[in-house]
């Protein structure tokens, strides 16, 4: 029995059959953040739950000091969601004043890291800008898209203000990678 | 011929392989929706088209009153956009006090219920506050990760306020999920 | 060695086993537009980098005049998101008049163009009022979901205005398919 | 099914406030829009204005100085007054449910004389 | 304010019979747009929704179409029930405006 009877004609003899359930896959949910060090002029990186609740790693995807490190090479699937919360009515000097100025902004930036590479990429951003009028406001920013990674890549999640950041629920902010 | 030939080295002997269009999947876009008796603290859920225009269900994913049923244990992509629209300015009070106050919000939560499980588990939310300053105002909610489900899993999409959904076109507002 | 040893019992026989790498992916990149024609009542398209940076085409997925083509049927995931920017403050009325009136609006729409079909088919929509106080004003809208495509589908993304696209950096606005 | 019934005086003397209330029943007023529209003797529909559950409104800008919305969740009713009447006024008056597309459930109507 | 002109403004036709009446907007609104009809004495009904959606219970003779700008309702055949005032509306925005109507009348 042939292997290409399984297969379509396209398929390239080099590319092996794999069983989907063995593919690397995670999803980590949001935890109460510790404030820690971060370069200056780089966003500060979220850190996750990874094996309680909703949250799990497997088939050697792990997670580790705020990374997901990716463990073999191919086409991944990477998203993320922030839902950002704030507590002071963000234009009141435009209300005020009477003139505009420029707006503050929640930003989030799913980032790759390469060992062999000295600067980080940039994958996936988002950024909105913040002028809301009430002074309890709250929304989510959702990215996802699919990256070609290579193995021991790692994967972060930054934002523009940790302390922004809604810990509360498990279901509000998550990021997740799975392989292709 | 041994089934290793086709797998990498690291793959579960016991993980079949699987064709992938024999995966279950689905699409439901927006239909009218008719209000229904709900608990009093829980959203109301969505009902759907599953079968017209872009909506389809196959492979023993299957659509019946508002849930999506699970066929099969497994990693799904759960995902859904709801457009919320409204026709009040929903911070008025604020602009004439002059004084801020609780904005009101819109809300989607992806929802599984397990019939052995007393408790629905609330898989993912986005929720916005709506402080808008003119009268006519409309948004998209977009949720979408990937989640460990069992066969028998049922999903719905629960929504704020039913009211407030558009439902004019089936690209605006949507749910879907496939296995991995 | 029978097929079935490697299939789970529902699989069904005609559904041939494909290796993953060998599946058609694309994700693309912003650039700067360079305003075209366009019918009058459609939204212009958005063009696109497909092999610099982030960007790929693979496996016959291929890029041309500002379409993805499909190159064989199957079901794809399909996502994009657009960062939208604007320079005035687009409910100034509002303020001045102490009325509220119809607000602006960004839009997003992947539109699937069929040749033996006289109408394009709007897959995904996201659109969303701006109606911003401050005067530098920034927004994502971000779409994704899976259809049912057929070999030879064309895929584009629609804008309401292409004058409003962040086209500063490849994280920001993009553009992708793979087929699952 | 959801059922709305007006009620109020059907008749109001020139420069006076016209007041109606509307009662809803067989669902919570706690979602969706709650409108009022009016229909002078033999013409067309004029929509006046709505209300939702949370107390915002919106008003027809052509009547916007002299109408009023309230909502009364506790007692499952919202009131229309229109103050400054005169006898272009005159109209049968409805009171509705709305979501983002439709008007989907009317009152019966009830007529509004304005006339001294 | 968003214009709604409905034509004609009166209709004669009888049972059995194909008819079609016509809204336009004044400005594109997309599908926020129905068609009511009202019988004398009572309150409008809705019959078609988001331009061509049939409310539940509304027999399947009558059908809406159009998007933007123009829109069509169409009575199928004619049945003596039918003869009322049908109205097209807008909610795309405020405030939501009504057509003037067209009357439907027996030949």
């Known amino acids: 029995l042939k292997g290409q009877e399984f297969a379509p004609s396209h398929q390239q003899v080099y590319a092996p059959l794999r069983a989907d359930g063995d593919k690397p896959r995670a999803h980590l949910t949001v935890v109460r953040q510790t404030p820690t060090q971060h370069f200056k002029n780089q966003f500060p990186a979220l850190h996750w739950e990874h094996e309680l609740g909703l949250a799990f790693t497997k088939n050697r995807m792990n997670y580790t000091n705020k990374f997901l490190l990716i463990p073999e090479s191919g086409d991944y699937f990477i998203y993320s969601q922030v839902t950002f919360r704030g507590m002071t009515s963000e234009c009141s000097e435009i209300r005020q004043a009477g003139r505009p100025n420029k707006p503050d902004s929640i930003t989030v930036v799913i980032t790759k890291v390469t060992d062999s590479y000295p600067e980080p990429t940039q994958l996936l951003m988002g950024t909105k800008s913040v002028c809301e009028v009430g002074s309890n406001w709250f929304q989510p920013i959702y990215l996802g898209a699919m990256f070609s990674l290579q193995e021991g890549d790692k994967l972060m999640v930054n934002v523009s203000d940790i302390s922004l950041v809604d810990y509360t629920k498990e279901d509000k902010t998550f990021f997740g990678a799975f392989l292709l | 011929l041994k089934g290793q030939e086709f797998a990498p080295s690291h793959q579960q002997v016991y993980a079949p392989l699987r064709a992938d269009g024999d995966k279950p999947r689905a699409h439901l876009t927006v239909v009218r929706q008719t209000p229904t008796q709900h608990f009093k603290n829980q959203f109301p859920a969505l009902h759907w088209e599953h079968e017209l225009g872009l909506a389809f269900t196959k492979n023993r994913m299957n659509y019946t009153n508002k849930f999506l049923l699970i066929p099969e244990s497994g990693d799904y992509f759960i995902y859904s956009q709801v457009t919320f629209r409204g026709m009040t300015s929903e911070c008025s009070e604020i602009r004439q006090a002059g004084r801020p106050n609780k904005p009101d919000s819109i809300t989607v939560v992806i929802t599984k219920v397990t019939d052995s499980y007393p408790e629905p588990t609330q898989l993912l939310m986005g929720t916005k506050s709506v402080c808008e300053v003119g009268s006519n105002w409309f948004q998209p909610i977009y949720l979408g990760a990937m989640f460990s489900l069992q066969e028998g899993d049922k999903l719905m999409v629960n929504v704020s306020d039913i009211s407030l959904v558009d439902y004019t076109k089936e690209d605006k507002t949507f749910f879907g999920a496939f296995l991995l | 060695l029978k097929g079935q040893e490697f299939a789970p019992s529902h699989q069904q026989v005609y559904a041939p086993l494909r290796a993953d790498g060998d599946k058609p992916r694309a994700h693309l990149t912003v650039v700067r537009q360079t305003p075209t024609q366009h019918f009058k009542n459609q939204f212009p398209a958005l063009h696109w980098e497909h092999e610099l940076g982030l960007a790929f085409t693979k496996n016959r997925m291929n890029y041309t005049n500002k379409f993805l083509l499909i190159p064989e049927s199957g079901d794809y995931f399909i996502y994009s998101q657009v960062t939208f920017r604007g320079m005035t403050s687009e409910c100034s009325e509002i303020r001045q008049a102490g009325r509220p009136n119809k607000p602006d609006s960004i839009t997003v729409v992947i539109t699937k163009v069929t040749d033996s079909y006289p109408e394009p088919t709007q897959l995904l929509m996201g659109t969303k009022s701006v109606c911003e106080v401050g005067s530098n004003w920034f927004q994502p809208i971000y779409l994704g979901a899976m259809f049912s495509l057929q070999e030879g589908d064309k895929l584009m993304v629609n804008v309401s205005d292409i004058s409003l696209v962040d086209y500063t950096k490849e994280d920001k606005t993009f553009f992708g398919a793979f087929l699952l | 099914q959801v059922q709305l019934q007006e009620s109020g005086p059907g008749l109001v003397k020139p420069s006076e406030t016209l007041s109606l209330t509307c009662t809803v029943s067989?669902?919570?007023?706690?979602?969706?829009?709650w409108s009022w529209i009016r229909q002078p003797p033999g013409k067309g529909l004029e929509w006046i204005g709505l209300i939702y559950y949370s107390g915002s409104t919106n008003y027809n800008p052509s009547l916007k100085s002299r109408v009023t919305i309230s909502v009364d969740t506790s007692k499952n009713q919202f009131s229309l007054k229109l103050s400054s009447v005169t006898a272009a006024d005159t109209a049968v008056y409805y009171c509705?449910?709305?979501?983002?597309?439709?008007?989907?459930?009317w009152g019966q109507g009830t007529l509004v004389t304005v006339s001294s | 304010d968003i214009q709604m002109t409905q034509s004609p403004s009166s209709l004669s036709a009888s049972v059995g019979d194909r008819v079609t009446i016509t809204c336009r907007a004044s400005?594109?609104?997309?599908?926020?747009f129905n068609w009511y009809q009202q019988k004398a004495g009572e309150a409008p009904k809705l019959l078609i929704y988001a331009a061509s959606s049939l409310q539940s219970g509304v027999p399947s003779r009558f059908s809406g179409s159009g998007s933007g700008t123009d829109f069509t309702l169409t009575i199928s055949s004619l049945q003596p029930e039918d003869f009322a005032t049908y109205y097209c509306?807008?909610?795309?925005?405020?405030?939501?405006?009504f057509g003037q109507g067209t009357r439907l009348e027996i030949k």
């Open positions: 067989g669902g919570s007023i706690s979602s969706y829009y």
């Open positions: 509306q807008q909610s795309y925005s405020t405030p939501i405006t």
């Open positions: 400005q594109t609104i997309s599908s926020y």
């Open positions: 509705a449910r709305a979501d983002v597309v439709t008007i989907d459930y």
